[in-house]
Amino acid sequence: NIDVCKLGTVTVQPAPVIPLGSAANISCSLNPKQGCSHYPSSNELILLKFVNDVLVENLHGKKVHDHTGHSSTFQVTNLSLGMTLFVCKLNCSNSQKKPPVPVCGVEISVGVAPEPPQNISCVQEGENGTVACSWNSGKVTYLKTNYTLQLSGPNNLTCQKQCFSDNRQNCNRLDLGINLSPDLAESRFIVRVTAINDLGNSSSLPHTFTFLDIVIPLPPWDIRINFLNASGSRGTLQWEDEGQVVLNQLRYQPLNSTSWNMVNATNAKGKYDLRDLRPFTEYEFQISSKLHLSGGSWSNWSESLRTRTPEEEPVGILDIWYMKQDIDYDRQQISLFWKSLNPSEARGKILHYQVTLQEVTKKTTLQNTTRHTSWTRVIPRTGAWTASVSAANSKGASAPTHINIVDLCGTGLLAPHQVSAKSENMDNILVTWQPPKKADSAVREYIVEWRALQPGSITKFPPHWLRIPPDNMSALISENIKPYICYEIRVHALSESQGGCSSIRGDSKHKAPVSGPHITAITEKKERLFISWTHIPFPEQRGCILHYRIYWKERDSTAQPELCEIQYRRSQNSHPISSLQPRVTYVLWMTAVTAAGESPQGNEREFCPQGKAN
């Protein structure tokens, strides 16, 4: 930091601002009677170069001229773009201990002349806005560069504004502060930008425009929508616009959508009727404006109006299924289940369901409303029953869906054949089948139904089902399918008044079970041993168990155990074996097998048969 140049002066030739690649000569001169006090000949002038306040070079070797003890000239080259500081210091060589004393300094700026400004673009926001222009300045000059924006137009209209660029601010936009009015709509205006700095100047090409070219209307405001007769599909969108607007663009979409519906409206005067809205749907609406049909620019989009369309009565039909169980000698319990309508069918908040159960011949009718998606009733086992369900919102009810209550697995001739279940990936199972061989009535549809093979409440854990057309023989089930859980899957073939079904077990992913069955008892009856067990707890099965294995060997024997493999049936919890010798102590245990492998062994039990085996 140099306060004042008391000891001397520093000058630069040709100038303190030079083009990139040029050299400069820096002269450092001592004022009269300044310098080292006793021996002027011992005066040594040195030049130090600083970039960003950091000393980068001592230019001692760049001296090109020297008046011993009075002045020195140094040549500097290869200066980088921007500003470089040079400081001249006096070094009194007889006094080694004193540091050099600053004499004076100079800043040299290296830069380039400005390029002609390009891509001039002018806008006036709204009819009452002011004209602002922006441009591309071209390459950075590294020097303070002044820009002048000049506008000329009809009736000797002239106007200009200035700004500058340097290393702290950039000038590429100016607001002229004048307003062009619609009565000048046909007039032509010319703007040009001139750039000037210490190394030169340049001018843009003239840019010509009209009022319509540059005026961008303000975006519409105060947007609202009025639904005609509380309709969920028809509404009138209304808004405020600037007076000169002749064209609007409307865009609207449901909030969860990714594509807009676009509409152009000419001379809309702030009003437009929409007829294709979805009832009970959150929509976002935006509007843009233009002052001329062919020319001019669109305004920015307005702020969004977000609103929900009103409800309309539900459409579509409910997907109904049921479960039938005899609960005493002459009564059955019918549990009806149905799937919720999707939003485009519900068209509102479903308030309740209307359920009807009717005995066709005696005309007995049970009716109720429920807010749940299931309904259970006890009815006589006799008679032909039909059920119907409809969904109601605040505007009305859907058409009732009817289903005949038949014995779902009552007709063997309607049972589908060759049912298989194959795991496709972690969360679905492919079920395939062949049609019934000798159905005496046509299959109207197939229902694939599945339930987890683990304890559940009949009403809290409803079945999952898929309706399949009669010409399809496969279904990919994925709803509520979890890995490592075994599902019982039924394929129902339904005719008008009968049903037949086939069952299979399946899982989407399996592991070997965590443990084997627990042997609870071994009893001897008629020269046979009966092994009884408790099943593996459901969480430990880890898929569908294919079979159990009972192992036995003589106690203390090192031989391989013998084994008996039993097809897994949940209802079975004991099995006879008859190849054990009497009065020999055996060790027995069990394992379980899934498609992934065998479980570790369950508990061991010792038993010594008493009777005559075989």
């Epitope: 683990q454 304890p455 009403t459 809290k460």
Partner: nanobody, 119 residues
Framework: QVQLQESGGGLVQAGDSLRLSCTAS????????MYWYRQAPGKQREFVAY???????NYLDSVNGRFTISRDNAENSVYLQMNSLKPEDTVVYYC?????????????WGQGTQVTVSS
């Protein structure tokens, strides 16, 4: 396994009331559908009332309006409030629970409680 224990039976006059209780214990996490049945000597067991997980109830026609089934989930209990009892209500009342595994319904029964209504 699930164990069911009934209580509350007894001898009452026609027109009186009784409240039967049934408490469930054991593996009851999936027991939501609870029933009352009754059985007279030499007759088949008949359904009286049930209550579902969603507290939907249904009754045998002859007891509808006189009997009310209710439940207390915190106590794992189900109740049968019997009003305006008649001599023909004299039978053994059984508590029943049903749960489903796959498509098989497992049933659990209490040991029964005797209700006697004298005229």
């Amino acid at each position: 396994q699930v164990q069911l224990q009934e209580s509350g039976g007894g001898l009452v006059q026609a027109g009186d009331s009784l409240r039967l209780s049934c408490t469930a214990s054991g593996s009851i996490f999936a027991i939501d559908d609870m029933y009352w049945y009754r059985q007279a000597p030499g007759k088949q067991r008949e359904f009286v009332a049930y209550i579902t997980a969603t507290n939907s109830a249904n009754y045998l026609d002859s007891v509808n309006g006189r009997f009310t089934i209710s439940r207390d989930n915190a106590e794992n209990s189900v109740y049968l409030q019997m009003n305006s009892l008649k001599p023909e209500d004299t039978v053994v009342y059984y508590c029943n629970a049903k749960q489903i595994v796959g498509f098989q319904i497992d049933e659990y029964w209490g040991q029964g409680t005797q209700v006697t209504v004298s005229s």
